[in-house]
């Protein structure tokens, strides 16, 4: 006799990094026939949804219309078919961004380097934070954590053309509350035929799309649930 149903998948749209006062949708995908889904936040019930008709729906969306620091944290969901409940989903870390201040990102020796050169990024924020995050825009996961009183350094080591791309950093006030993003720094690494854009598998995005945080770490991964647990989510564990 099966005691529980398989765990559902959970993810955030458009992104797990949510600017304060913006809307985010938490998606929970279970099974067709599920009559109720529950979203839990930090261990307590946050919301309930009863899809109609349940036999034609296997995913629900929980809307958070106005993101703030009180709603940043760890979410999970469960679903019910008849009287049988599922295992809880993996944890989703929801991060609120655009809190307080904007860090400054710089790169040494400069934004244009030759393949093989040692490159270090510096993220500086003159407010009460000691953790910093460096993110590379694109589909793949390029997130580093650094520590420092007002500045953290992120040594990339000898770079290759794979390091080309646009970087931003955040100050982190806690695991789930991050600063505004820094201005972007585009790293150009010569030694490849094309050095003014990212490789096709790691595309750049127009600058204005950063505001919706569609472009770092999870884009292209959110829908591929098997990959959900790695990427930037692991930094928050």
């Amino acid at each position: 006799q099966q005691q529980t149903l398989p765990k559902p998948f959970i993810w955030a749209e458009p992104h797990f990094m949510v600017p304060k006062e913006k809307q985010v949708t938490i998606c929970c995908q279970g099974n067709y026939g599920a009559v109720e889904y529950q979203l839990h936040f930090e261990g307590s019930l946050f919301a309930v949804d009863r899809p109609k008709p349940p036999e034609r729906i296997n995913k629900v969306q929980f809307y958070i219309p106005d993101m703030n620091s009180r709603m940043a944290g760890q979410y999970s969901c469960i679903y019910r078919v008849g009287e049988l409940w599922s295992e809880p989903s993996n944890l989703l870390d929801l991060v609120v961004t655009e809190m307080y201040d904007t860090p400054t990102l710089s790169v040494h020796p400069g934004p244009e380097v030759i393949s093989g050169e040692k490159v270090t990024f510096y993220c500086r924020l003159d407010t009460a934070t000691s953790m910093f995050l460096l993110l590379k825009e694109g589909r793949s996961s390029h997130v580093q954590r650094g520590y420092g009183k007002v500045q953290a350094e992120f040594p990339l080591g000898p770079v290759t053309t794979a390091h080309r791309g646009t970087y931003r950093c955040f100050g982190s006030y806690n695991n789930h509350a991050w600063s505004f993003p820094s201005e972007p720094v585009k790293l150009l690494v010569t030694g490849d035929i094309e050095n003014t854009s990212l490789a096709p598998e790691d595309p750049t995005f127009p600058a204005d799309t950063w505001g919706t945080y569609l472009l770092t770490t999870e884009t292209g991964l959110q829908k591929d649930h098997a990959l959900w647990d790695h990427t930037a989510q692991n930094l928050l564990r």
Epitope: S44, L45, A47, D49, R50, Y63, I64, D66, N68
Partner: nanobody
């Protein structure tokens, strides 16, 4: 934003009933998922009941299930809480709250999901 005004509170004997109302103005109530919360002196605000925006699905915690019923009349722009078999431990200030969600079916049980709040109405249950 929507403005919310609660009414219907008062003093009632244990075992009695009350019906709270929450009148909305400024925006149509059908744009909001709604909830009732309560706060007794010295205690945290506690979830009592919630109702989805369109589907009318409801949720209540075990402490009031079977005794309290939440309902809404979108045409009258009013939310209700029917409270039966009242107990002294139900004594509190009762607040209605609104969440501007696009979802027709989400039912919110967490106070931080609600952006608009009424001023509250006092309910006192004597033994």
């Amino acid at each position: 934003d929507v403005q919310l005004v609660e009414s219907g509170g008062g003093l009632v004997q244990a075992g009695g009933s009350l019906r709270l109302s929450c009148a909305a103005s400024g925006r149509t109530l059908s744009s909001y998922a709604m909830g009732w919360f309560r706060q007794a002196p010295g205690l945290e605000r506690e979830f009592v009941a919630a109702i989805s925006r369109i589907s009318g699905d409801t949720y209540s915690p075990d402490s009031v299930k079977g005794r309290f019923t939440i309902s809404r009349d979108n045409a009258k722009n009013t939310l209700y809480l029917q409270m039966n078999s009242l107990k002294p431990e139900d004594t509190a200030v009762y607040y209605c709250a609104a969440s501007a969600t696009p979802s027709a079916t989400n039912i919110y049980t967490n106070q931080y999901a609600y952006g608009d709040w009424g001023q509250g109405t006092q309910v006192t249950v004597s033994s």
